[in-house]
Amino acid sequence: GSQHIRAEKAMVDGSWLDLAKRSKLEAQPFAHLTINATDIPSGSHKVSLSSWYHDRGWAKISNMTFSNGKLIVNQDGFYYLYANICFRHHETSGDLATEYLQLMVYVTKTSIKIPSSHTLMKGGSTKYWSGNSEFHFYSINVGGFFKLRSGEEISIEVSNPSLLDPDQDATYFGAFKVRDID
Amino acid sequence: GSQHIRAEKAMVDGSWLDLAKRSKLEAQPFAHLTINATDIPSGSHKVSLSSWYHDRGWAKISNMTFSNGKLIVNQDGFYYLYANICFRHHETSGDLATEYLQLMVYVTKTSIKIPSSHTLMKGGSTKYWSGNSEFHFYSINVGGFFKLRSGEEISIEVSNPSLLDPDQDATYFGAFKVRDID
Amino acid sequence: GSQHIRAEKAMVDGSWLDLAKRSKLEAQPFAHLTINATDIPSGSHKVSLSSWYHDRGWAKISNMTFSNGKLIVNQDGFYYLYANICFRHHETSGDLATEYLQLMVYVTKTSIKIPSSHTLMKGGSTKYWSGNSEFHFYSINVGGFFKLRSGEEISIEVSNPSLLDPDQDATYFGAFKVRDID
């Protein structure tokens, strides 16, 4: 009888350990990716940024994948997504082609099943960066809560990529899972 | 036998209560600190802001410590950190020393073990606040997901602190723990 | 005896299932509301935005209620609140009444019990949108961690509502519950 009770208890322990593992101990996905400025496009138009660090300095990733410039969702869920994009110009970098700039970021979601891209969040500003000042700076922050499915991809598009601040504290984006889909 | 079964059940209950306490019911750390404007430094250079409220109005703290102007981590984990910093100037406050301003925020992490400070996030803008307008305003928001260890300290640095908006809804920073470190 | 043991086990299972449901499986409240631009007030003064989508595109809501232009809390807790507000103007829309603008957002909390409204977060900028440029754009992002009680209401106020960008990726606000109140 005592042996049977212990078996019952083990079942209880085991099933609950499974539940606990799934509900809490199973690592919730996250990513914080910082700009890799060694390969920034040259144009002033809107471009997708494909070079990001995922494993140095503040950059990190867990239970998500970074591939071909995109953050890939491995686990269905509701995620908080965010991006911080800094632009800067110093007169030593040369003369700007135009002093009227559109400094923008677009956080996009792509579904492989339905090969289409949709903008989840956008932010930015038009700026007049006159030659009267030797230094100019501007940062954008966006964030929001989105349902993401396994296999979906998050990417970042910006205008005027050659003006990006290459510091890891300046230009980054990320995500963390907040809860499951019901 | 029945007594033995109850003891077994109590063990199951007890161990799971411990697990539940650790995994869910143990309060997850957080803080939302609002500016204490009674002690804002003057000058236009970059300074660390040391005066924040932690227990009035919207300000609150739990399982973190506020000491010497720094938010101290008591529990290892991955945290979402954020800051909202508002700058403003009204002509009744007097003439600005310069109309070309760098309005910036830096969210920094200091480790006591290795006495060094690192910037986790930065944001802001250069602004031209001309005398043609009687009122000027600008806000910065930054946020990101970071691994923090017990004993590490988070602090806020800004440029032009004398231009800070002293309202609790304007100038604040905070953190909340999202998940454990694996 | 064996039947009694099973009953004990069922009690253990049942109580833990309750705990698990409450602690994890009970859906944590959230909302992501996107601007409904069919009913945006005119004028340049501060107005409350009452028209938001909650069930189309990126907009969604769970365990919270949207009513009369306000996001109503149904479950006590600590929530992360956020808003992203975009303003834009193209010369084809006509001349601005003034080139000096205050583009602001206020995230407010109203308690029905104590009929008063308080600003939780604010952000924005004064802007000079001159006629030299055919297009102007500016975005604001704010976010913070707040204790909300069941029945409290969150609303969004902005200045210059007629300049709002009506895209769902541009102008939105939201909330998600992070943890219980101790």
Partner: antibody
């Protein structure tokens, strides 16, 4: 592939006008400044004019200022050079060229067309 | 306007030679200098920008150096495909000018 194709050249009498076009493909035309450069027979290269990616800023060599106008239509991926009051010394092969950097001046011209010949006589 | 003076005007060399072409600006242009190669009947081709940055796809035997008023283009080991005319081009304050060219011919 990235390509620029000039057209509109020909023989014209002094004092008359001509409009050159440059059709761009293979890159985001609206993201880059564009130049016109010319080369007289058996001579070196001479810069003529430049236009920023958004059309807001344009600059000209002294030799053509007031006579030539550079413009673009980003919807058609096309650059133009309107040449008025043409002179014999304007005889040359005219090249359009793309700025290497869209944001900054000064980085050089990384894509060139094959050129179109203008003869003023 | 800033004048650009290239030297020599003509250079005779053999395959495998190390070749250096100089370009002088009439006033400082910082590092805002580019080098181009042009073959008869063809459009110019960008080799070097910002004085020393090698354009994508250009062989590494080409290199640029200098700043201020004095700049050089070096071909470390001349190849048969390198016989052409080379131009420097400066940028300064919304004005662009080319040097008169250096013709590299077979000795």
């Amino acid at each position: 592939q990235v390509q620029l194709v000039e057209s509109g050249g020909g023989v014209v009498q002094p004092g008359r006008s001509l409009r050159l076009s440059c059709a761009a493909s293979g890159f985001t035309f609206s993201g880059y400044g564009m130049h016109w450069v010319r080369q007289a027979p058996d001579k070196g290269l001479e810069w003529v004019a430049v236009l920023s990616y958004d059309g807001t800023n344009k600059y000209y060599a002294d030799s053509v200022k007031g006579r030539f106008t550079i413009s673009r239509d980003n919807s058609k991926n096309t650059l133009y050079l309107q040449m008025n009051s043409l002179r014999a010394e304007d005889t040359a092969v005219y090249y359009c060229a793309k700025c290497l950097s869209g944001t900054y001046w000064g980085y050089g011209m990384d894509v060139w067309g094959q050129g179109t010949t203008v003869t003023v006589s | 306007d800033i004048q650009m003076t290239q030297s020599p005007s003509t250079l005779s060399a053999s395959v495998g030679d190390r070749v250096t072409i100089t370009c002088r600006a009439s006033q400082s242009i910082s590092s805002w200098l580019a080098w181009y190669q042009q073959k008869p009947g063809k459009a110019p081709k960008l080799l070097i920008y910002k004085a020393s940055s090698l354009e994508s796809g250009v062989p590494s035997r080409f290199s640029g150096s200098g700043s201020g008023t004095e700049f050089t283009l070096t071909i470390s080991s001349l190849q048969p495909d390198d016989f052409a005319t080379y131009y420097c081009q400066q940028y300064n304050s919304y004005s662009w000018t080319f040097g008169q060219g250096t013709k590299v011919e077979i000795k």
